[in-house]
């Protein structure tokens, strides 16, 4: 070995070196939160970066660069290291357009913490495994979805765009001429039904047990779906979306009596399924999944 | 496809009487207002009269208590009763109503439709 290697690898294993990297992580942390940070943080920055820069040297120097098992680039860790500096320089010296996109790469130095703290290291490692273990489960959750997905599709494809439509219109205006001069939400709340405080128009349905239209107004099938149009079951996709909804219960509850105020109340065992099977089995699956990686790491 | 036909126009004396009727047919879901409309000759289209789902009613000035409109909402029909009628009234008679109907690949619609008219003439 070099005079060179052996100081590097001196450097390397001692503690106040890890100590170092670390207190430089997190205070340049600290400076990447500031909202206007003064003139002098920038001479700050240099400093950071020249520190990465002789901490990714000392392991070049003391490990290799890429040829041979246990050298720097071997190191997924590193990469990310390698990545970070050349990122610092790439802003620093080299006019790319739209710096404040590549400036966002900044925010890798923060993932720096992981390879230095080895408990971190541990649970990241964990985390990497399961989610290699998750694909089986995540193949399932797809395919439970998609097909409920379609199933949600062919049941209610269309039904939230009914609305509660003003009966009494003057008397040469039509539905196709009201919709064509319809802009903004208050000419919407002309002719439209609005429970007090909604910003959609009042759901109904053509089934007896679906949702019905006060006296002066008739359920027409028109317009645009609830939530800005992202709501509803009218393609694969946007079926596909209300399932995950469902299954992660994220406000479940507002598109359940959506849909059952559109298609009627007999659908509410299409949510039961969906919720038991979606919500309460695959979500557990994926948990237990991620429970025994983690286990297994441990071990 | 919807379709709304017109059927009772014809000939009639002044003063007279006439029971015209408006028929919906399709998949019809729902049926909104039910309106007539007339148009003489050289004239432009207007208003008569008017039915709600809920069998809430208005008519023109020219026909006030002269003219009543009903519905019969199984049938999907809507009706208009013309008494004391008068030459002015002569015009082509037609129906129009707000329809939801269920169309080709089980899909549904709402619009506005239209009949073909009836020709009802006042004179002596």
């Known amino acids: 070995f070099s005079p060179l290697r052996r100081i590097s690898i001196k450097i390397l294993v001692h503690s106040l070196f890890s100590m170092l990297i670390m207190c430089t992580i997190l205070t340049n942390c600290i400076f990447m939160t500031m909202n206007n940070p003064p003139d002098w943080t920038k001479n700050v920055e240099y400093t950071f970066t020249g520190i990465y820069t002789f901490e990714s040297l000392v392991k070049i120097l003391a490990r290799g660069f890429c040829v041979g098992e246990f050298t720097f680039l071997r190191d997924p860790w590193n990469w990310l290291d390698f990545v970070v500096i050349v990122f610092a320089y790439l802003t620093e010296f080299v006019n790319l357009g739209n710096v404040s996109a590549l400036r966002t790469f900044r925010v890798l130095r923060a993932l720096k913490t992981i390879s230095v703290i080895p408990g971190l290291k541990t649970i990241v490692g964990a985390l990497i495994q399961s989610v290699k273990k998750l694909s089986d489960v995540m193949i399932l959750t797809v395919f439970c979805l998609s097909v409920f997905a379609l199933i949600g599709l062919q049941l209610f494809m269309g039904n939230l765009k009914h609305k509660c439509f003003r009966n009494s219109l003057e008397n040469n205006e039509t539905l196709e001429s009201i919709m064509n001069t319809l802009e903004s939400e208050e000419d919407f709340r002309k002719y439209f039904y609005y429970l007090e405080g909604s910003k959609d128009a009042l759901l109904c349905g053509f089934s007896t047990d679906s949702g019905q239209c006060p006296e002066g107004y008739t359920c027409v099938k028109i317009g645009r779906n609830p939530d800005y149009g992202y709501t509803s079951f009218d393609t694969f996709s946007w079926a596909f979306l209300a399932l995950f909804r469902l299954m992660t219960q994220d406000y479940w509850e507002n598109l359940y009596q959506q849909t059952l105020r559109a298609a009627g109340k007999t659908y509410m065992i299409f949510f039961v399924v969906v919720i038991f099977l979606g919500s309460f089995y695959l979500i557990n699956l994926i948990l237990a999944v991620v429970a025994m990686a983690y286990e297994e790491q441990n071990q | 496809e919807v379709q709304l036909v017109e059927s009772g126009g014809g000939v009639v004396q002044p003063g007279g009487s006439l029971r015209l009727s408006c028929d919906a047919s399709g998949r019809i879901l729902r049926i909104g207002y039910m309106r007539w409309h007339r148009q003489g000759a050289g004239k432009q289209r207007e208003f008569v009269a008017r039915?709600?789902?809920?069998?809430?009613?208005d008519y023109a000035d020219s026909v006030k208590g002269r003219f009543t409109i009903s519905r019969d909402n199984a049938k999907n029909t809507v009706y208009l009763q013309m008494n004391s009628l008068r030459p002015e009234d002569t015009a082509l008679y037609y129906c129009?109503?707000?329809?939801?109907?269920?169309?080709?690949?089980?899909?549904?619609?709402?619009?506005?439709?239209w009949g073909q008219g009836t020709l009802v003439t006042v004179s002596s």
């Open positions: 129009n109503a707000l329809v939801t109907a269920s169309v080709r690949g089980g899909s549904i619609h709402s619009g506005t439709y």
């Open positions: 039915i709600t789902d809920d069998s809430a009613t």
